[in-house]
């Protein structure tokens, strides 16, 4: 560590004083301390010298010895004292600039350590300190406002009692700048944009920052905008608003557009789309199938999207058949909007009853025309099943009656027993009928198939079932003769259980 | 031994706010006093101010109107923000470590600032 | 309008020693210590001398300075042709209270 010579913390000397400061290092060393008037510097060897022959109030500081080649980077300081009877303060800034929450040291320097006790701060033209200004002083440093605020940016003086009566420094301007998180905060209005050539056509601009040094600007398709810029502050904050209007837009205005700002914290760009269009336009879609097929008792959502521009003038839902006259309540009917020209609308059809199978149509109006997109909603039903004994041609047989959608398929068991469904271990034989005839096939409705099982004797104590199943589910009928020599007697004869 | 390195746009409009940052590497920002000197093309050097880490400044009083100076330690760096430039103001900027008889040592590069529209 | 004022261009021949003059006032280098400074073509400025004849660690002593009442001196002895380069005074200023730069010398190596 250098070593100062005179070896004391602190000197006090008269103006016009000769001043001589020695710092001896083990290598070369150099002094610092505030930029100021009358010092002469000059190296010897291992040591510099710090002098002046005419010591002012302007000498007043500390200062500080390094050996810059010292990886410890040790120092030592000594601080110096003209003491001036006129002048009390030796201020070394015109100006302070901190970030908020940060402390403002105020660099007054007192020039004679007796003055400490009967020092204040107080603001230009006798003003008092704004409240909770929490502050402190050092008579080697000055005041320090501690955590500053951007209202506390005002001009200070500081003052020392001498004989009786107040004696004021030059002012120091304080700066407390607002922290700059981050670049400015953008919007660009709106976010997309569609017009028919020869419409006209806003789009703003707009960044804001809690300072005020920051640049803006608006370009197209690469290519800066000259637009005049409108400038505010509120909210604590600085605005910078560009507004583009164009009477009557055409096919080159069309493109990006993208709104740029930046300051020292760097840079943040929005983009939007600007799209010129001959006519209106009016477009349907949907993600889902139009054709779709559902369980009866479930619930199902109709999603259309609509892209238009301009707005829709009027939409709606109808159901079109073909069971009933009645509409889809409008309180079903959902429309969300996901942007400017996109739409979506929503049909809830909860619990879907048999009578609500059929088409559903999704109407929409703008300039450009109408426009439909019609849904086929066909309701799914697991089989039901009945079984009849009769005579076909002399031979009797059992019919299966089988009916729900999508076609069911038909299986035949015969198991031994008295039974309402037959298991494994009782079957005796099974038939397949790969081609039951289809007895009606109408759209939206069931599907009703029918098959045939030709039996020459019903043997008594044995089960008949019918077995019919589709992808929603199976159902079965079982039955069973009561009599032997059942084959001789008219059907009627015969208790069948479902 | 202390490096500077000044970064900030080379062109900048009339009326508009010229912004340089000056980097200190190989060396600590705290406890020295940092300026901006100035130098337009075929001129002679100007010095526009100084400013202490504690956030203490001086500045040139033909500029004082237009200076702002700021440092922010954690970064090692300090900067400098010009008002309302004018042609007048293009030169080449170079910012250094002012020692205590006021000289200047060591210095940055220098960026050149060219004001026009 | 410079505050010091230096003649705007010097010359000498290789070997040669050449002096670059510095005027002021009572105010900057009648009160206040002179500093010197090079700068070489198309570079930043280097500190020559400081403290009227300081050099720091480095620079030639080919390179001197001197001071008396309110004018200073550049003497560079030896000349080369490296030395060929624009030399600025500067000097403190009660006035200003802060650093005042001369117009600069134009050094040409014959």
């Known amino acids: 560590i250098p070593v100062i010579e005179p070896s004391v913390p602190e000197l006090v000397v008269k103006p016009g004083a000769t001043v001589t400061l020695r710092c001896v290092g083990n290598g070369s060393v150099e002094w610092d301390g505030p930029p100021s008037p009358h010092w002469t510097l000059y190296s010897d060897g291992s040591s510099s010298i710090l002098s002046t022959n005419n010591a002012t109030f302007q000498n007043t500081g500390t200062y500080r010895c390094t050996e810059p080649g010292d990886p410890l980077g040790g120092s030592a300081a000594i601080h110096l004292y003209v003491k001036d009877p006129a002048r009390p303060w030796n201020v070394l800034a015109q100006e302070v600039v901190v970030f908020e929450d940060q402390d403002a040291l105020l660099p007054c320097l007192l020039t004679d350590p007796v003055l400490e006790a009967g020092v204040s701060l107080v603001r230009v033209r006798g003003r008092p300190l704004m409240r909770h200004t929490n502050y402190s002083f050092s008579p080697w440093h000055g005041f320090t406002i501690h955590r500053a605020k951007f209202i506390q940016s005002q001009d200070y003086q500081c003052s020392a009692l001498m004989g009786g009566r107040k004696v004021m420094s030059i002012s120091i301007r304080l700066k407390v700048q607002k922290v700059i998180p981050g670049p400015p905060a953008l919007t660009l209005v709106p976010a997309e944009l569609v017009r028919i050539r020869g419409e006209a056509a806003q789009i703003v601009c707009s960044a804001s920052s809690v300072d005020v040094n920051f640049d803006v600007f608006l370009q197209h398709n690469n290519t800066k905008l000259a637009i005049p810029q409108q400038s505010d502050f509120h909210n604590n904050r600085y605005q910078k608003v560009l507004t583009l209007n164009l009477d009557q837009v055409d096919f080159q205005h069309a493109g990006n557009y993208s709104c740029v700002a930046s300051n020292v914290q760097g840079k943040h760009s929005t983009s939007m789309f600007f799209r010129v269009v001959e006519s209106a336009y009016l477009n349907l879609s949907s993600e889902q199938n139009l054709i779709q097929e559902v369980t009866v008792g479930e619930g199902l959502n109709l999603k259309v999207m609509v892209e238009a521009y301009p707005g829709l003038q009027g939409f709606n839902w109808t159901y079109l058949g073909p069971f009933s006259d009645h509409q889809p309540e409008p309180k079903l009917a959902n429309a969300t909007t996901k942007d400017t020209y996109r739409h979506t609308f929503t049909l809830s059809l909860p619990r879907l009853k048999p009578s609500e199978a059929g088409r559903y149509s999704f109407l929409a109006r703008n300039p450009g025309g109408w426009r439909a997109l019609t849904f086929e909603l066909t309701l799914r039903y697991p089989p039901e099943v009945s079984v009849i004994w009769t005579f076909i041609n002399g031979s009797g047989t059992l019919l299966c009656a089988a009916s729900g959608y999508p076609q069911p398929n038909v299986t035949w068991l015969q198991c031994s027993g008295h039974t309402d469904r037959c298991d494994e271990a009782q079957v005796l034989q099974v038939w397949d009928d790969p081609y039951p005839e289809v007895l009606s096939q109408e759209p939206f409705h069931k599907v009703t198939v029918q098959s045939l099982l030709t039996v020459e004797t019903l043997e008594h104590n044995q089960t008949y079932e019918c077995r019919a199943h589709n992808s929603v589910g199976s159902g079965s009928w079982a039955f069973i003769p009561i009599s032997a020599g059942a084959h001789t007697h008219p059907p009627d004869e015969f208790l069948f259980t479902p | 031994q202390v490096q500077l390195q000044e970064s900030g746009p080379g062109l900048v409009k009339p009326s508009e706010t010229l912004s340089l940052t000056c980097t200190v590497s190989?060396?600590?920002?705290?406890?020295?006093?940092w300026s901006w000197i100035r130098q337009p093309a075929g001129k002679g050097l100007e010095w526009i101010g100084r400013i202490y880490t504690s956030g203490s400044t001086n500045y040139n009083p033909s500029l004082k109107s237009r200076v702002t100076m700021s440092v922010d330690t954690s970064k090692n760096q300090f900067s400098l923000k010009l008002t309302s430039v004018t042609a007048a103001d293009t030169a080449v900027y170079y910012c250094?470590?002012?020692?205590?008889?006021?000289?200047?040592?060591?210095w940055g590069q220098g960026t050149l600032v060219t004001v026009s529209s | 309008q410079s505050v010091l004022t230096q003649p705007p261009s010097a010359s000498g021949t290789p070997g040669q020693r050449v002096t670059i003059s510095c005027s002021g006032s009572s105010s900057n280098i009648g009160s206040n210590t002179v500093n010197w400074y090079q700068q070489l073509p198309g570079t930043a400025p280097k500190l020559l001398i400081y403290s009227n004849n300081q050099r720091p660690s480095g620079v030639p002593d080919r390179f001197s300075g001197s001071k008396s009442g309110t004018s200073a001196s550049l003497a560079i002895s030896g000349l080369q042709s490296e030395d060929e380069a624009d030399y600025y005074c500067a000097a403190w200023d009660d006035s200003l209270n802060g650093p005042v730069f001369g117009g600069g010398t134009k050094l040409t190596v014959l």
């Open positions: 250094a470590r002012e020692r205590i008889t006021s000289f200047f040592d060591p």
């Open positions: 190989d060396g600590s920002i705290s406890s020295y006093y």
